[in-house]
């Protein structure tokens, strides 16, 4: 990252307000699920590792005109802090994976339930 | 509706560290990036760095890498600049201002600044 | 770090004319993803910036239709296309683009 002319460095550990949100609104959309979620549209699978917020809006925002996650969206460019646009294609996609949305929104709240369990908030 | 409310004018002796705050109501603080911006008596703008409170991670103007820290604290809603060493070229309006994706990340509301003055 | 050179300095005019702000920048500010984050402020006397135009040719809520940013790559023009008392002040183009973002060195906008 320094190659950009400036330097991105990771703050601190917030405390988990930040995540607890993420995490809830997450579960507000798999809980309210009627019809398949954006229309059964597909996402790029991520590596849940270091970087997965970037990854996951990454993924997310290439989803457009569902508003079940716009929320989701907004909230994750709040953990992720460079700036992301559709289209862009990240290292931590998992290459030639895709999934539904509606599994990605899940397999990304199992593990941030993990996280928060684990007291990892950043 | 949106406010962003930052901390009271302050004097500083030479040397000395400065915290300013801003604290932030009428939307999710975690969702929208915190950009810190100086601005000298009659002068331009400047961009100091910006901090994504969800993750508390930032990207920073390499130029205030060792005078100015940002961190959050998201119990309170509040973003903080902490301004170290200070010298007669630290005095100025220190801003800072919401980075909303919705507008790609373009700084939508502002606080009022604080203005900072450094003197014996 | 991407200088931004705005011009005029100054901008004297009479209320109701048009009115033109010229950014340039010292490199390309396409972002890596294909955006381009040129922005253009407004800071009126003794006022907090506030925001005119996101994404080159974008106009925030609020902001009258007026108002017009356009450009790309590195040359970027703000019009205004009847200027009003309330539009006084300081323009500022930002690029967002290539960290540390920078502003321009503003022009002020007064009336002849």
């Known amino acids: 990252l320094t190659c950009l002319g400036g330097f991105a460095s990771p703050g601190p550990v917030p405390p988990s307000t930040a995540l607890r949100e993420l995490i809830e609104e997450l579960v507000n959309i798999t809980q309210n699920q009627k019809a398949p979620l954006c229309n059964g549209s597909m996402v790029w699978s991520i590596n849940l590792t270091a970087g997965m917020y970037c990854a996951a809006l990454e993924s997310l925002i290439n989803v457009s005109g569902c508003s079940a996650i716009e929320k989701t969206q907004r909230m994750l460019s709040g953990f992720c802090p460079h700036k992301v646009s559709a289209g862009q294609f990240s290292s931590l996609h998992v290459r030639d994976t895709k999934i539904e949305v509606a599994q990605f929104v899940k397999d990304l709240l199992l593990h941030l339930k993990k996280l928060f369990r684990e007291g990892q908030f950043n | 509706q949106v406010q962003l409310q930052q901390s009271g004018d302050d004097l500083v002796k030479p040397g000395a560290s400065v915290k300013l705050s801003c604290k932030a109501s009428?939307?999710?603080?975690?969702?929208?990036?915190i950009n810190w911006i100086k601005q000298r008596p009659g002068q331009g703008l400047e961009w100091i760095g910006h901090?994504?409170?969800?993750?508390?991670?930032?990207y920073d103007n390499e130029m205030f890498k060792d005078k100015a820290k940002l961190t959050v604290d998201t119990s309170s809603n509040t973003a903080y600049i902490h301004l170290s060493s200070l010298s007669s070229e630290d005095s100025a309006v220190y801003f800072c201002a919401r980075g909303s994706f919705t507008f790609f990340y373009a700084m939508d509301y502002w606080g009022q600044g604080t203005s900072v003055t450094v003197s014996s | 770090d991407v200088l931004m050179t705005q011009t005029p300095l100054s901008l004297p005019v009479s209320l109701g004319d048009q009115a033109s702000i010229s950014c340039r920048s010292s490199?390309?500010?396409?972002?890596?993803?294909?955006?381009?984050?040129l922005e253009w402020y407004l800071q009126r006397p003794g006022q907090s910036p506030k925001l005119l135009i996101y994404k080159v040719s974008n106009r925030f809520s609020g902001v009258p239709d007026r108002f017009s940013g356009s450009g790309s790559g590195t040359d970027f023009t703000l019009k205004i296309s009847r200027v009003e008392a309330e539009d006084l002040g300081v323009y500022y183009c930002?690029?967002?683009?290539?960290?540390?973002?920078?502003f321009g060195g503003g022009t002020k906008l007064e009336i002849k």
């Open positions: 930002f690029q967002g683009s290539h960290v540390p973002y920078t």
């Open positions: 490199q390309n500010i396409v972002h890596s993803n294909g955006k381009t984050y």
């Open positions: 901090i994504a409170p969800g993750s508390g991670e930032t």
């Open positions: 009428g939307y999710t603080f975690t969702s929208y990036w």
